[in-house]
Amino acid sequence: MCYGKCARCIGHSLVGLALLCIIANILLYFPNGETKYASENHLSRFVWFFSGIVGGGLLMLLPAFVFIGLEQDDCCGCCGHENCGKRCAMLSSVLAALIGIAGSGYCVIVAALGLAEGPLCLDSFGQWNYTFASTEGQYLLDTSTWSQCTEPKHIVEWNVSLFSILLALGGIEFILCLIQVINGVLGGICGFCCSRQQQYDC
């Protein structure tokens, strides 16, 4: 039952990654552990896209639980053949994986845009603006520019770290869902089991 085991493994990985995405996104609302910036709406616009909470988080739990459920042994058959039901389930998991691809893709895109634009911060002229927006992401390579942001404390480090984490987590989720698309298609077409004998039975 290698296709099912693979799907289950991917499912468990996605649950962990989704939870990490949700945590990373929540932390973006509290720069330096303070709530005042969220209440004053002094947060990057891309924080409000909920990419980690929705895209890489909640939306990822749906395919994750579908994948985990694929290895259950009491799967109903079709036309008297148990494995046919499992093959249908494997093919339907491809749809769930596509939802996962959409969610993780959204997470990756928003995180990349958040990194490119940089944080909303108080600059040395007392203006709340996207201080690094005009640098087209070059600020990421020149940490000496980060001191342009005078508030919140360490906001550039905070934003860069968390959006990078969301980018990485979303990327891993995307790859895992892509693997499950391939796994689901192979499992559905070639049969649920690895042995040629069992495939023939179906």
Epitope: S124, F125, G126, T135, S144, S147, Q148, E151
Partner: antibody, heavy 113, light 107 residues
Framework: EVQLQQSGPELVKPGASVKMSCKAS????????MHWVKQKPGQGLEWIGY????????NYNEKFKGKATLTSDRSSNTAYMELSSLTSEDSAVYYC??????WGRGTLVTVSA | DIQMTQSPASLSASVGETVTITCRAS??????LAWFQQKQGKSPQLLVY???TLAEGVPSRFSGGGSGTQFSLKINSLQPADFGSYYC?????????FGSGTKLEIK
């Protein structure tokens, strides 16, 4: 009306230290960065550093690290700059500026034996 | 550190004239540039920041332009109050260095 009241002129001996103040009024002190700028007589402007009174974040011009120390006291709405190990090169007018928009009148420091 | 080169070092002009002061950065500073005016014995005053944003209370005859490494401050229809020294300053990274200044004198 925003006002930055700087402390009076200082005549100090080489090797000594001096601490000047910049008392702010007319705005929320902790909401704005305070910059410090040096100007030698008849010369141009030199940025020393800034302090954010809310977060106490400071950033210095590398040239003034170890020379200048920026602090602030939110209870009295006052920013301070202490200059140590003074030499004749430190003789100048020192300005405090709220986000560059509003400037103090400057504190003249004269280092002389 | 980023070097800021101002030109000319000094300039004589008459009331009503239009003058342009230029500032060159040794490295791309995007639009992170400010202009200051300082009159003899007085504190500097912010005129322009972010290359072209006029500070509050600054007359519209002042205008800033440029980006990257080349910047300019244009003063239309010079007034007696406009004479003094002008400084550019980048605020791209630490240290926020000033130009050496341009002294604008009455002809």
């Amino acid at each position: 009306e925003v006002q930055l009241q700087q402390s009076g002129p200082e005549l100090v001996k080489p090797g000594a230290s001096v601490k000047m103040s910049c008392k702010a009024s007319g705005y929320t002190f902790s909401s704005y960065v305070m910059h410090w700028v040096k100007q030698k007589p008849g010369q141009g402007l030199e940025w020393i550093g800034y302090i954010n009174p809310y977060s106490d974040v400071t950033n210095y011009n590398e040239k003034f690290k170890g020379k200048a120390t920026l602090t602030s006291d939110r209870s009295s709405n006052t920013a301070y700059m202490e200059l140590s190990s003074l030499t004749s090169e430190d003789s100048a007018v020192y300005y405090c500026a709220r986000n560059y928009f509003d400037w103090g009148r400057g504190t003249l420091v004269t280092v002389s034996a | 550190d980023i070097q800021m080169t101002q030109s000319p070092a000094s300039l004589s002009a008459s009331v009503g004239e239009t003058v342009t002061i230029t500032c060159r950065a040794s490295k791309n500073v995007y639009s992170y540039l400010a202009w200051f005016q300082q009159k003899q014995g007085k504190s500097p005053q912010l005129l322009v920041y972010n290359a072209k944003t006029l500070a509050e209370g600054v007359p519209s005859r002042f205008s800033g332009g440029g980006s990257g490494t080349q910047f300019s401050l244009k003063i239309n229809s010079l007034q007696p109050a406009d004479f003094g020294s002008y400084y550019c300053q980048h605020h791209y990274n630490i240290p926020f260095t000033f130009g050496s200044g341009t002294k604008l004198e009455i002809k």
